[in-house]
């Protein structure tokens, strides 16, 4: 195929021009088949093409890699692995490629891989290695600062029988080579709680976005070790109240901004605290936007707008709300 | 293991079309890939197109791009493979596979039907 041109516009793949050509070790800036290539972007798109593989024959320069819209379905063990190594790879998207397997090691020999978006894959066999590459205890820092996983969840009648909450923690937490993590979206993944040990371990957090997920209750999760965290995105769940152990560890985080608008709140006792807490803080600029869900008198009624006499226990909950 | 059954195959004039069915049965989700292959009188099996239970991603040798679609319904445990414009050198024997990689090659598929006959003539 034809090498790329250095101007800035992208330079398709050509057709091979004969057997005997294909045949030779790829050049090093060649643009591989179905691929558009910008030598002077650094930028390489292998975008909507059905693709069932990762090109092998990508060029040494590529710094942006879009392999979007694809048929990848498995990403194997160094699946990026070239030699000389893609040295300056820093942004990687792999989003709506019909993955549903990413094994150990998928992206090892990625040393300055800083962006990695696998959304929209419905990836029921995420190895817990996939993104530190070994099974060590303590594995080599991974290069990654930002890592998009939204929308991952397989459908319903796909998912295997397992916690997928718990896979993609395994996965986020192996060998702790995430830990200089500072980005992080999890939104769409239909989580029903906030596994711990996640919020401990990645203390390099500066934004974590849950949004669109089924979360009922951050009774469990601490927010202590997030420092830095800066951004805390909650929106479109299904959070009934916040208690006084999560609020008091938000207030201790010095620039954390906390949306939860579109919760299904519930005012009745146990709200108390929350409202108070509400009226008070800079913590949640989206507060004047948050109403009550239940009880039934109480629907829409804005949560700053609730005095404590307001907010009484003898309303009858629906059975879904009352067991979680 | 999984057993695979095929059917669906049959005589038809070039231009027509044929539907396949695999039903799959056993613990048809262990096996990740399903695939079609073919096998013409006097020649090798070659592979025809595959589909991934989870998550349905699919790929096509490049003679029957655009003409075949593979599918499959999980609720049923069956895959399909929609032939159309059928050509004279589409005869063979098509086989369902399953298997747990995203291959070609006969050697990724560890479970096999019995075959169906598709013959394309005037």
């Known amino acids: 195929s034809s090498p790329t041109s250095s101007a800035s516009s992208f330079s398709s793949s050509a057709p091979f021009l004969a057997s005997a050509v294909s045949a030779q070790p790829p050049l090093p800036d060649q643009c591989p088949a179905l691929c558009e290539c910008s030598e002077a972007a650094r930028t390489v798109k292998c975008v909507n093409r059905n693709l069932t593989e990762v090109p092998t024959d990508l060029p040494a320069y590529v710094r942006n890699l879009f392999l979007t819209g694809n048929q990848l379905a498995v990403l194997p063990a160094g699946a990026f692995a070239r030699r000389p190594p893609l040295a300056e790879l820093a942004a990687l998207n792999l989003s709506g490629s019909r993955l549903d397997e990413v094994r150990a090691g998928a992206f090892e020999h990625l040393p300055s891989l800083r962006q990695l978006d696998l959304s929209h894959n419905p990836l029921a066999d995420l190895s817990p290695f996939a993104f530190s590459g070994s099974n060590a205890s303590v594995s080599a820092p991974s290069p990654l600062v930002e890592l998009i996983l939204n929308h991952i969840v397989p459908p319903e009648d796909e998912r295997q029988n397992r916690s997928f909450e718990g896979m993609v923690v395994a996965a986020l937490l192996s060998g702790l080579a995430l830990r200089g993590l500072t980005r992080l979206e999890l939104a769409s993944n239909h989580f029903l709680f906030l596994p711990r040990d996640l919020l401990a371990q990645l203390p390099s957090l500066r934004y974590l976005d849950l949004r669109n997920n089924s979360l009922v209750s951050l009774t469990y999760a601490s927010f202590r070790n997030l420092t830095h965290l800066e951004s805390l995105h909650l929106e479109d769940n299904a959070l009934k109240v916040l208690h006084n152990s999560t609020l008091a560890e938000w207030h201790g985080l010095a620039h954390v901004k906390v949306f939860l608008d579109n919760n299904p709140w519930v005012c009745d006792c146990y709200m108390a605290d929350m409202v108070a807490w509400l009226k008070e803080t800079e913590v949640v600029p989206d507060k004047a936007r948050l109403t009550c869900a239940f009880p039934e008198k109480m629907r829409n009624r804005g949560l700053l707008d609730l005095n404590s006499s307001d907010l009484d226990c003898d309303a009858v909950l629906p059975q879904s709300l009352q067991t979680s | 293991e999984v057993q695979l059954v095929e059917s669906g195959g049959g005589e038809v004039q070039p231009g027509g079309s044929l539907r396949l069915s695999c039903a799959a049965s056993g613990r048809p989700f262990s096996s990740k890939t399903m695939a079609w292959f073919r096998q013409a009188p006097g020649k090798e099996r070659e592979f025809v197109a595959a589909v991934r239970w989870i998550g349905g991603a699919t790929r096509y040798t490049e003679s029957v791009k655009g003409r075949f679609t593979i599918s499959r319904d999980n609720a049923k445990n069956t895959v399909y493979l929609q032939m159309s414009s059928l050509r004279a050198e589409d005869t063979a024997v098509y086989y369902c596979?399953?298997?747990?990689?995203?291959?070609?090659?006969?050697?990724?598929?560890?479970?096999w039907g019995q075959g169906t006959l598709v013959t394309v003539k005037p």
């Open positions: 596979a399953a298997g747990q990689a995203w291959g070609t090659k006969f050697t990724d598929y560890s479970d």
